[in-house]
Interface confidence: medium
């Protein structure tokens, strides 16, 4: 369990940099995370909205906090979901 946990952690932390990348090859991963963020109402992988770097401007309403039931915080003057997606992804992987 702890070994697979560590591998998942390392993989997610490694892939965080893909969110701020601008190449076509990273786009698929970014779009998968966007879907995940929408579904679980979280933002980014490790550091929240900051993980998206300049892409935060390219995907409008990327992490927009629209759900009153979830904690929000301000980022670059925008209300975004406070929770990062890493724990949701780990839970999701554990259940599947």
């Amino acid at each position: 369990k702890s070994k697979s946990d560590r591998i998942v952690n390392e993989t997610l932390y490694e892939n965080t940099k893909l969110l701020s990348a601008t190449g076509e090859s990273e786009k698929q991963f970014q779009e998968a995370i966007i879907v995940f963020q929408e579904e679980f109402k979280c933002c980014g992988l490790v550091n929240g909205a900051a993980d998206w770097g300049n892409n935060f401007q390219h995907y409008p309403e990327l992490c927009a906090c629209l759900d009153k039931q979830r904690p929000c915080q301000s980022y670059n003057g925008k209300q975004v979901y406070k929770e990062t997606c890493i724990s949701f992804i780990k839970d999701f992987l554990a259940k599947n």
Epitope: E31, I34, V35, E38, E39, K41, H58, Y59, P60, E61, A64, C65, L66, D67, K68, C72, G77, K78, Q79
Partner: antibody
Framework: EVQLLESGGGLVQPGGSLRLSCAAS????????MSWVRQAPGKGLEWVSG????????YYADSVKGRFTISRDNSKNTLYLQMNSLRAEDTAVYYC?????????WGQGTLVTVSS | QSVLTQPPSASGTPGQRVTISCTGS????????VSWYQQLPGTAPKLLIY???HRPSGVPDRFSGSKSGTSASLAISGLRSEDEADYYC???????????FGGGTKLTV
């Protein structure tokens, strides 16, 4: 150039149904949340519904909840609004707008008239 | 009854400065950005101000927006006859999980 073109409006009897479409072009449709806003004759703007880029979240005004359904087809760059159990008070020009927390582009609107 | 409150009308003469107010609550203006829309007679609305005070490209700097607490305002300086239109403020409302508009202000020049 961003373009939004609504269609599907018309005259319908109370209790009837109508499906509005909004064809989008000039931007990457799948990156953007989209919304519907309406305006009754001589009245102000009223937000109707919004949908996130990948349809993961949908939001509705209380006045249409349970009767209207928003959807999108990213492969066709098209936004939809399925309107059921229509009432006289749903009579309005329906605008399709880009985004959900700022409406930065609007279509020209399509008129829906609910009358017997 | 609109969630955001605007005066129904405002007026001014060419060259004058006019201000339109928009009052909301902590769940809308108090916690989210305000946008302003201009609707010229017989046309679709157009984004005039976003994120409280930013102008989209193409909007003259005669238009400016500001926000303080749960209120926002739109100022138009150097009024022109072509500014005659309906102006609406709007913001996302966290309590309603929906977007809310003001009732609109009809500006007469």
């Amino acid at each position: 150039e961003v373009q939004l073109l609504e269609s599907g409006g018309g005259l319908v009897q109370p209790g009837g149904s109508l499906r509005l479409s909004c064809a989008a072009s000039g931007f990457t449709f799948s990156n953007y949340a989209m919304s519907w806003v309406r305006q009754a004759p001589g009245k102000g703007l009223e937000w109707v519904s919004g949908i996130s880029p990948n349809s993961g979240n949908k939001y509705y005004a209380d006045s249409v909840k349970g009767r209207f359904t928003i959807s999108r087809d990213n492969s066709k760059n098209t936004l939809y609004l399925q309107m059921n159990s229509l009432r006289a008070e749903d009579t309005a020009v329906y605008y399709c707008a880009r985004r959900s927390t700022i409406f930065d582009y609007w279509g020209q609107g399509t008129l829906v008239t609910v009358s017997s | 009854q609109s969630v955001l409150t605007q005066p129904p009308s405002a007026s001014g003469t060419p060259g004058q400065r006019v201000t339109i107010s928009c009052t909301g609550s902590s769940s809308n203006i108090g916690s989210n950005d305000v946008s302003w829309y201009q609707q010229l007679p017989g046309t679709a609305p157009k984004l005039l101000i976003y994120d409280n005070s930013h102008r989209p490209s193409g909007v003259p700097d005669r238009f400016s927006g500001s926000k303080s607490g749960t209120s926002a305002s739109l100022a138009i300086s150097g009024l022109r006859s072509e500014d005659e239109a309906d102006y609406y403020c709007g913001a996302w409302d966290a309590s309603l999980s929906g977007y809310v508009f003001g009732g609109g202000t009809k500006l007469t020049v």
